[in-house]
Amino acid sequence: DVNEAPQFSQHVFQAKVSEDVAIGTKVGNVTAKDPEGLDISYSLRGDTRGWLKIDHVTGEIFSVAPLDREAGSPYRVQVVATEVGGSSLSSVSEFHLILMDVNDNPPRLAKDYTGLFFCHPLSAPGSLIFEATDDDQHLFRGPHFTFSLGSGSLQNDWEVSKINGTHARLSTRHTEFEEREYVVLIRINDGGRPPLEGIVSLPVTFCSCVEGSCFRPAGHKHHHHHH
């Protein structure tokens, strides 16, 4: 009878864990069997970030340091299964740790919204659409932001209404605006765990228009029109 090396149950073991998991948390496990029925000792190889430890007997893998998704995900290490006794033959598999984002980034505007304007005077109430985003990974669905005005004093002049999980519409409540820039504060809540809120500012200019563009003295660029 030729002595054979242990055999892992999988070529690659994969686990997913939140990047804010507590030190000492079990993040996964591996299993192997020895064809001759010998006991197996498990070890890790290539844990260059020093994040993990393995129970030599059970194959359970635990975190031993804070995990950081920014360092790169998946994090791959090798797992070694070695016979205890006999010829000490070993085999190698891989353990891939996929780091899931935690809700640690507040919502923000998806792009630069400088240059929004309405032609003054307004002939009818106007509106514009804006988009929110954040830098979190949304695991089982897209973001579901909710939108509101950032301060009560704005409610006489403006209203904000949700279009979908990422877009909202800012509308004027009347037409009596001065010929100047208004900064409208918008509160965006991501509904996450924990919920994070961002307050963003949309600068909106009411200006005299020439051929549908905001009239500016020489040297100033035309702004984008919204209505």
Epitope: H11, V12, K16, R45, G46, D47, T48, G72, S73, P74, Y75, R76, V77, Q78, E94, I98, M100, H138, L139, F140
Partner: antibody
């Protein structure tokens, strides 16, 4: 043998949504990640995101966060990619692509679905 | 995100001659944990989906002719077609599968001179 069969071409108006399906056969559906890659006319390949059918975990490219949703139906071995708030620049061929054995390259590809966004 | 840069954008090679495509990564694709380079190469012909040629920088997919070979490590990689055949006319892409988000190079168009 592994087969990925995608739904047919779609024409959509700006602002609408599209849902593309990808039916997998010839392997254990929950054992491999499924990716979505798109290619605009005359352009290169762009990874949109991936789903692990075993637990519905998704990982989306930042560019598509909030507009893309990937789902799966294990009873039919089908994955879906829905893209909302369509604009003309979303006109592209959309491919599903299965991950490789033991890692994450794209070992098998669907035939592609042309999505045209036009008013 | 890891940026993949391919060169040249296009090249014309005579039948039977060698074609060499380069791919440079903005980050090291060699995992110190597994000692593998997480780089793949694909071939795409007009009207067809991409076809995988190489993964782990140098491992050929089954059924891929041995005139295709991949080499390199770390940040610099090469796809070589040792003797160009007419059916090799296509666009070739590199892709990193090291860290999310997976990213592609811009592509290299190979034509016959």
């Amino acid at each position: 043998q592994v087969q990925l069969v995608q739904s047919g071409a779609e024409v959509k108006k700006p602002g609408a949504s599209v849902k593309v399906s990808c039916k997998a056969s010839g392997y254990t559906f929950t054992d491999y990640w499924m990716n979505w890659v798109r290619q605009a006319p005359g352009q290169g390949l762009e990874w949109m995101g991936a789903i692990d059918p075993s637990d519905r975990y998704t990982n989306y490219a930042q560019k598509f966060q909030g507009r893309v949703t990937m789902t799966r139906d294990t009873s039919t071995s089908t994955v879906y990619m829905e893209l909302s708030s369509l604009r003309s620049e979303d006109t592209a061929v959309y491919y599903c692509a299965r991950g490789g054995y033991g890692d994450y390259w794209f070992a098998n590809w669907g035939q592609g679905t042309l999505v045209t966004v036009s008013s | 995100d890891i940026v993949m840069t391919q060169s040249p954008d296009s090249l014309a090679v005579s039948l039977g001659e060698r074609a060499t495509i380069n791919c440079k990564s903005s980050q090291n694709l060699l995992s110190s944990g597994t000692q593998k380079n997480y780089l793949a190469w694909y071939q795409q012909k007009p009207g067809q989906p991409p076809k995988p040629l190489i993964y782990f920088a140098s491992t050929r997919e089954s059924g891929v002719p041995d005139r295709f070979s991949g080499s390199g490590s770390g940040t610099d990689f090469t796809l070589t077609i040792s003797s160009l055949q007419a059916e090799d006319v296509a666009v070739y892409y590199c892709q990193q599968h090291h860290y999310f988000p997976w990213t592609f190079g811009g592509g290299t168009k190979v034509e016959i001179k």
